[in-house]
Interface confidence: low
């Protein structure tokens, strides 16, 4: 089957009757009383453009109304990576809160107790703060009732928000409620909630709005309570989200609560240049976008984007540019091409373009003339067998046709020179150059088609086999579609390349496949009745997506819903139109193009490419099993268009593909299921300040070690080595925690021991901040400090001197055991008087 | 004109090897290549292989190979075949030609090897 | 290896008949086919190339056709500078191999 037919947002029209109510700018409370004035399941869907598909947001100025469902139209920006177990939630993978921490630079403090304010609402809040606080404010409406106060226990980062508990007799007699709940996470975060618990009386309001965060942007309406649904999952693309609800009385239902948790934004899709590429590595902030040209294009500009953290995290330039050149040369060419430059501009209506191509040394090329469209007057093509302008011409716009086997070059470079003076029509030049082995044909070349061959290195006795990409046939059509590189001697093909062409009519009987105007992507000539028959299985229907039309005044693109132009009419297409689907009510589509005589339009882009594919003809997407090791919520009982599932993981697993899947309006999943993955991985331990640590593997596997290691001066502070091992639940673990290097302090020495006294635990140095403590012999008293610290410093100190053991009165008549006593310690024998000696057998006076 | 003349006859003695040359001139000789073919006395062409005088890369007919070496000197325009461990069915006629990949429209006038005891 | 067969092995004519020349392959070659003369003691010298493209400086009465496996050099009035060996050659994969030869005689 072909690929999914994507859906697009603009596809997806408003429903007759609903409403769009427009973003107060003002203030916050003009948009909850015009929501709450607004309420209820008449609101349609957004005809945004909004790119996360996990979002329902409009941007800021556009008419707002919500959407019933999350949309999944393409894959989401920013994982999702909630698990609610039966026991509570936790968070898993990369926007679990640990991560959560503040950017460097930054301090945490801790989050304001449920009676201290936080910082304020609105525009004077700044987006500058990098701390995360969640708030919670009892906004007064004007009414005889005083509001009950809403009192919440929110956690930073993760957690619920639940709807007041009014148990206390005193509430139940006060009628009001009125909440803001506000949720503020770190810059370059977003909030993401689902719906755990949703019980709510009709005269009960729950609103969802993305704060506006930036000073002036008001807050914009996600979602309210009518098109809320347990299970259901909001983001917003802002690091504030503001949950609003109000009673008129004390609720009588369950009330509601509300997971919450931050996950980390990312920069949009950069945009592709035109005629070139973009890969990128990651949206997140650090990834990167890298730029490259089509052949026969340069690069202006940047060539590696990187995006940036912030609020709204940004790339860090501007999405360069491919520009064709006007000549130059290529050294060493291989496979290439050379494209005329656009019009005007930089290089004025007038060139004189020159290119020279070189091949290496016993190489000759092979030019293919892919696209030319030449003012016969204005424009002049030549090519020359050499690399000066002085080389034989083979090829001179001016005398000859456009050769359809191209031209090879005697010797190894060719020189071509195109000539442009304010040409009538525009000009058009693509040729495709390629360097070949003398002792072998040159690669054959088919634009809109595929070639496979029995030998890549295209010796003789090679054959070349012909193929057309969907939409596209042969010319000229049927066997034979192979080609054969003969003659060892002189290698060549034994017929010329064949041709891609979009042909006038056909049959299509694929499942899938594509429609394209005659001579797409050329402009299509005047004088065309053209008709196409499609026919997929008997118990199918046929999507029909226009994904280009541009067509004529005059001319039309007829859609007959059967077999043939006696048909019920689908539709009759005109003039520019945007893009729409129509599905056909059985396995049947006739197609008719009908473009009367008259002058032709030079240039590209008149024309039109239709994709069709064949669809059940039931209208619920197919039953999915449940991931192994996980679990999905569904937001319908009936897998209808629109459905939402949502994926989750147990407990050391992680989610491997897309977690939110939407049954698209083509009865098509938005994606393939994804599955649960145990985790096998520790999280990166991080690098330690003032150290360097070693990996035994890049991926931290279970099993794998982290050594650090301290930079000179510095000494380790706890664990050296780091082991990632495995838990039966949970994601595997450290061993240890991260250590520190503690900056070293030279050693106290030991100050030695006091006449008629001793030391603890004996030693030559005391590093920083260890004590020394004391002790005095029987009969002898402590005069001075029992315990010494040694203080750091360069030198480091002791606290005071060493004390002195002074003899006492009622002990002198025992002198003879002290005598005894002193000429065995071994501590009298060390130099400077210091021993090792630990007797405790002192008395404490 | 294109011009391929070749070096005087051999005479060698059966086990020795010879080497035999081929100049161009007339035409630019590091953008062809230089076969050569074999023909006994009163039989028809063998062909023994190729050398593109540019790369200097050879491809040789199976039955040769061991037998002729192929080599060029680009900067005097000469072609050389080496025969080696020589036998009586080596006593031909050996021609070289100049040619695309696939056929021979200019040839040298041919020198003659004779292998006797 | 592509076998060759040229007939017949000789042939007898007179000045301003016409005369054909026979080549056949032991496989299907298309037109990869290049024809040679041979004059007693010269060197060959192309006539046709790809079984029917002629070559500069060589007289408009030879002339080449076929392909697959059975190809004909025609010369349509016999003169007696013609009077030579004439060789097929293939080209369509290795090793090139030229056929044994078709001898020209005066009858």
């Known amino acids: 089957d072909g690929a999914p037919l994507p859906l697009k947002e603009e596809e997806i029209l408003p429903e007759p009757g609903s409403e769009t109510p427009t973003v107060a700018s003002e203030a916050l409370a003009e948009l909850l009383h015009g929501a709450l004035l607004r309420r209820g399941p008449e609101m349609g869907y957004l005809p945004g453009s909004d790119r996360d598909p996990t979002l329902a947001t409009p941007p800021a100025g556009q008419t707002l109304a919500v959407p019933s469902l999350p949309r999944a139209t393409e894959p989401g920006t920013g994982p999702l990576t909630t698990a609610v177990t039966p026991n509570g939630v936790r968070g898993a993978g990369p926007t679990a809160p640990e991560l959560l921490t503040p950017p460097p630079g930054t301090t945490a403090p801790p989050p304001p107790s449920p009676a201290s304010p936080g910082p304020p609402l609105g525009p004077e809040g700044g987006e500058e703060e990098t701390t995360t606080t969640i708030i919670t404010t009892t906004t007064v409406t004007t009414t005889v009732t005083s509001p009950v106060l809403c009192n919440n226990n929110i956690s930073e980062g993760e957690g619920y928000v639940e709807s007041p508990d009014l148990g206390s007799p005193v509430s139940r007699t006060l009628g009001l409620l009125d909440c803001t709940y506000s949720i503020h996470v770190y810059p370059g975060y977003g909030i993401e909630i689902q719906v755990q618990t949703l019980n709510l009386s009709q005269e009960e309001e729950l609103l969802v709005l993305a704060g506006g965060g930036s000073p002036g942007l008001a807050p914009r309406l996600l979602a309210n309570s009518s098109m809320l649904g347990e299970g259901q999952v909001l983001r917003s693309p802002t690091n504030r989200l503001l949950l609003h609800f109000q009673s008129p009385r004390v609720p009588r239902g369950g009330g509601f609560r509300i997971h919450y948790q931050a996950y980390l934004l990312s920069c949009g899709f950069p945009p592709r240049p035109a005629h070139g590429d973009v890969s990128v590595t990651d949206l997140h902030p650090g990834g990167t976008a890298t730029f490259h040209c089509d052949s026969g294009y340069q690069l202006q500009g940047e060539e590696t984007l990187i995006c940036l953290n912030g609020t709204r995290p940004s790339w860090n330039g501007e999405t360069p540019s491919c520009m064709a050149s006007c000549g130059g040369t290529i050294h060493n060419a291989t496979l290439g091409r050379i494209v005329s430059p656009e019009p005007g501009g930089a290089v004025g209506p007038n060139l004189t373009c020159r290119w020279v191509i070189e091949a290496a040394e016993g190489r000759r090329l092979h030019l293919h003339f892919e696209r030319v469209s030449l003012d016969e007057d204005n424009d002049r093509l030549m090519v020359r067998s050499g690399g000066s302008p002085l080389s034989p011409v083979i090829y001179d716009s001016d005398m000859d046709d456009v050769p359809e086997r191209g031209l090879i070059s005697d010797a190894q470079s060719l020189y071509v020179e195109l000539l442009s003076e304010t040409p009538a029509n525009p000009l058009l030049l693509s040729l495709r150059f390629e360097a070949f082995e003398e002792d072998r044909c040159f690669a054959p070349f088919l634009a809109h088609g595929n070639v496979t061959t029995t030998d890549p290195e295209y010796r003789p006795g090679a054959l070349a086999t012909f193929s057309c990409l969907p939409g596209y046939a042969l010319e000229p059509p049927g066997p034979p579609n192979a080609i054969e590189c003969v003659d060892p001697t002189e290698p060549h093909w034994n017929d010329t390349e064949p041709a891609c062409k979009a042909m006038c009519g056909g049959e299509l009987s694929e499942p899938a496949g594509v429609v394209l105007s005659p001579d797409w992507p050329q402009s299509y000539s005047p004088g065309q009745d053209c008709v196409w028959g499609v026919h997929v299985q008997e118990e199918k229907r046929i999507l029909l997506q226009v994904e280009i039309l541009n067509v004529r005044e005059g001319d039309m693109l007829t859609l007959f819903d059967g077999d043939g132009p006696s048909a019920r009419v689908l539709a009759q297409l005109r003039g520019p139109q945007p893009r729409r689907r129509l599905l056909s009510s059985g396995p049947d589509l006739t197609l008719q193009f009908q473009a009367p005589p008259g002058p032709p339009n030079p240039g590209l882009g008149q024309g039109f490419v239709l994709h069709f594919k064949e669809v059940p003809r039931n209208d619920t997407c197919p039953e999915l099993p449940p991931p192994e090791w996980g679990w999905r919520t569904a937001s319908h009982g009936d897998l209808i268009r629109g459905t939402v599932l949502t994926y989750q993981c147990e407990p050391g697993y992680e989610l491997l593909g897309s977690d939110i899947l939407t049954c698209q309006w083509d009865l098509s999943w938005s994606a393939a299921p994804p599955a649960c993955q145990k985790i096998m991985t520790c999280a990166d331990p991080g690098e330690i300040a003032n150290g360097h640590r070693t990996a035994s593997d890049a991926g931290f596997p279970v099993g794998s070690h982290v050594q650090y290691r301290c930079l000179p001066g510095y000494s380790l502070e706890g664990a050296a080595m780091l082991t990632c091992y495995s838990r039966d639940t949970g994601t595997p673990k450290w061993s240890d925690r991260v250590p520190k290097c503690a900056l070293k302090y030279e050693p106290c020495l030991n100050p030695g021991v006091p006449e008629n006294g001793y030391q603890t635990l004996y030693k030559h140095h005391y590093q920083a901040g260890e004590s020394l403590r004391f002790f005095c012999y029987e009969g002898f008293e402590l005069i001075g400090e029992v315990t010494i610290t040694c203080v750091p410093g360069h030198p480091s100190q002791w606290t005071s001197q060493p004390p002195l053991c002074k003899v006492a009165y009622e002990e002198l008549l025992d002198n003879r055991k002290l005598e005894v006593t002193q000429t065995t310690d071994p501590s009298r024998q060390l130099e400077g008087g210091l021993a090792g000696h630990h007797h405790h057998h002192h008395h404490h006076h | 004109q294109v011009h391929l003349p070749q070096s005087r006859p051999e005479l060698v003695k059966p086990g020795a090897s010879v080497k035999i040359s081929c100049k161009a001139s007339?035409?630019?000789?590091?953008?062809?290549?230089i076969h050569w073919v074999k023909q006994r006395p009163g039989q028809g062409l063998e062909w023994i292989g190729y050398?593109?005088?540019?790369?200097?890369?050879?491809t040789y007919n199976q039955k040769f190979k061991g037998k002729a070496s192929l080599t060029a000197d680009n900067p005097s325009s000469t072609a050389y075949m080496h025969l080696s461990s020589l036998t009586s069915e080596d006593s031909a006629i050996y021609f070289c030609?100049?040619?695309?990949?696939?056929?021979?429209?200019?040839w040298g006038a041919g020198t003659t090897v004779t292998v006797s005891s | 290896d592509i076998l060759l067969t040229q007939s017949p092995a000789i042939l007898s004519v007179s000045p301003g008949e016409g005369v054909s020349f026979s080549c056949r392959a032991s496989?299907?070659?298309?037109?990869?086919i290049h024809w040679y003369q041979q004059r007693t003691n010269g060197s060959p010298r192309l006539l046709i190339k790809?079984?029917?493209e002629s070559i500069s400086g060589i007289p408009s009465r030879f002339s080449g056709s076929g392909s697959g496996t059975d190809f004909t050099l025609r010369i349509n009035s016999l003169e007696s500078e013609d009077i030579a060996d004439y060789y097929c050659?293939?080209?369509?994969?290795?090793?090139?191999?030229f056929g044994a030869g078709t001898k020209l005689e005066l009858k």
């Open positions: 030609a100049r040619g695309g990949v696939r056929y021979f429209d200019v």
């Open positions: 007339g035409y630019g000789f590091t953008r062809s290549y």
């Open positions: 050398i593109s005088s540019g790369s200097g890369g050879t």
């Open positions: 496989q299907s070659i298309g037109t990869s």
């Open positions: 790809y079984a029917s």
């Open positions: 050659q293939q080209s369509n994969s290795w090793p090139l191999t």
